[in-house]
Interface confidence: medium
């Protein structure tokens, strides 16, 4: 599956635990592998063009989201969301995807 | 079409019980989020309490904790709010709405509402 | 808990004014803040989710805006349907938290 797929149903995923059912052990469960994959590094074009384009700000994301778990401040976690909403608005905007 | 529709409301007195009900149609209800929100007469609007209906996971409005119970039978499409040790100041209109999220977005909100149902807590 | 300041209160305003009404949070709340409009006797109805996206159906003089924690509804010409009170709504956490309304009268 292409890395934009999956990082789209994952943030999806992700928000329905968090938002839904305020879970926040489920949320890192869907978060962490993708950002493994991510740290993995890029082994096609398509890999590569994501990278390039989103995987500065979901590494800030998830630094924000890491603090959260040392801090306990819930306003950590409100950074990760303010930029996980912004890539999953450009990855849904580029790539077509219907809800 | 989606439809949330209360009832159960009326007149209890104070310490009394009542058990709400939000029968819901047209939508997934197992994988829904359904809300309470209440309104006192001539007052704005109050969070109350929510459930995921997969899961069953809950949430509460301190005002209520301890006194309300939200449930959901998904073999009925009916969310629930038990009130039990009801005092004067939950006289209010109570409402349920489904919660949900959108394309393009991540963020959720209310976006079907029921017609309401009147509580009055009076001795 | 979040506060959700909305202001003002009331206001009153005429068919085709622009009407712009502000909510502020407490602290970071992200986008995640939605506008409802409910009529007397009724229930309240959702008009923007996720701070600016228009929710489907709504008329288009509608629109949202986000500035830090600082959240507009604005109403870019008035009509006569659309006398009512908004609220805003955050989701982020809970509880979660609604202004304490705007109520839009006819001048």
């Known amino acids: 599956i292409l890395w934009h797929e999956q990082w789209h149903e994952g943030l999806e995923e992700a928000s329905r635990l968090y938002f839904g059912d305020r879970n926040v052990k489920g949320m890192f469960e869907i978060l962490e592998p993708l950002h493994a994959m991510l740290e993995r590094g890029p082994q096609t074009l398509k890999e590569t063009s994501f990278s390039q384009a989103y995987g500065r700000e979901l590494t800030e994301a998830y630094e924000w989201s890491q603090r959260y778990k040392t801090s306990a401040v819930v306003m950590d976690l409100d950074r990760a969301w303010d930029i996980y909403y912004h890539v999953f608005q450009k990855i849904s905007r580029h790539h077509h995807h219907h809800h | 079409e989606v439809q949330l529709v209360e009832s159960g409301g009326g007149l209890v007195q104070p310490g009394g019980s009542l058990r709400l009900s939000c029968a819901a149609s047209?939508?997934?209800?197992?994988?829904?989020?359904i809300h309470w929100v209440r309104q006192a007469p001539g007052k704005g609007l109050e969070w109350v309490a929510s459930?995921?209906?997969?899961?069953?996971?809950?949430s509460y409005a301190d005002s209520v904790k301890g006194r309300f119970t939200i449930s959901a039978d998904t073999s009925k499409n009916t969310a629930y709010l038990q009130m039990n040790s009801l005092r004067a100041e939950d006289t209010a209109v109570y409402y349920c709405?489904?919660?949900?999220?959108?394309?393009?977005?991540?963020?959720?909100?209310?976006?079907?509402w029921g017609q309401g149902t009147l509580v009055t807590v009076s001795s | 808990d979040i506060q959700m300041t909305q202001s003002p209160s009331s206001l009153s305003a005429s068919v085709g004014d622009r009407v712009t009404i502000t909510c502020r949070a407490s602290?970071?709340?992200?986008?995640?803040v939605a506008w409802y409009q409910q009529k007397p006797g009724k229930a309240p109805k959702l008009l923007i989710y996720?701070?600016?996206s228009l929710y489907s159906g709504v008329p288009s003089r509608f629109s949202g805006s986000r500035s830090g924690t600082d959240f507009t509804l604005t109403i870019s010409s008035l009509q006569p349907e659309d006398f009512a009170t908004y609220y805003c709504?955050?989701?982020?956490?809970?509880?979660?938290?609604f202004g304490q309304g705007t109520k839009v009268e006819i001048k």
């Open positions: 709405a489904r919660f949900s999220s959108y394309y393009y977005t991540l963020y959720w909100a209310m976006d079907y």
């Open positions: 047209g939508f997934n209800f197992y994988s829904s989020y």
């Open positions: 459930i995921s209906s997969s899961s069953g996971s809950t």
């Open positions: 602290q970071s709340v992200s986008s995640a």
């Open positions: 996720s701070a600016s």
């Open positions: 709504q955050q989701s982020i956490h809970y509880p979660l938290t």
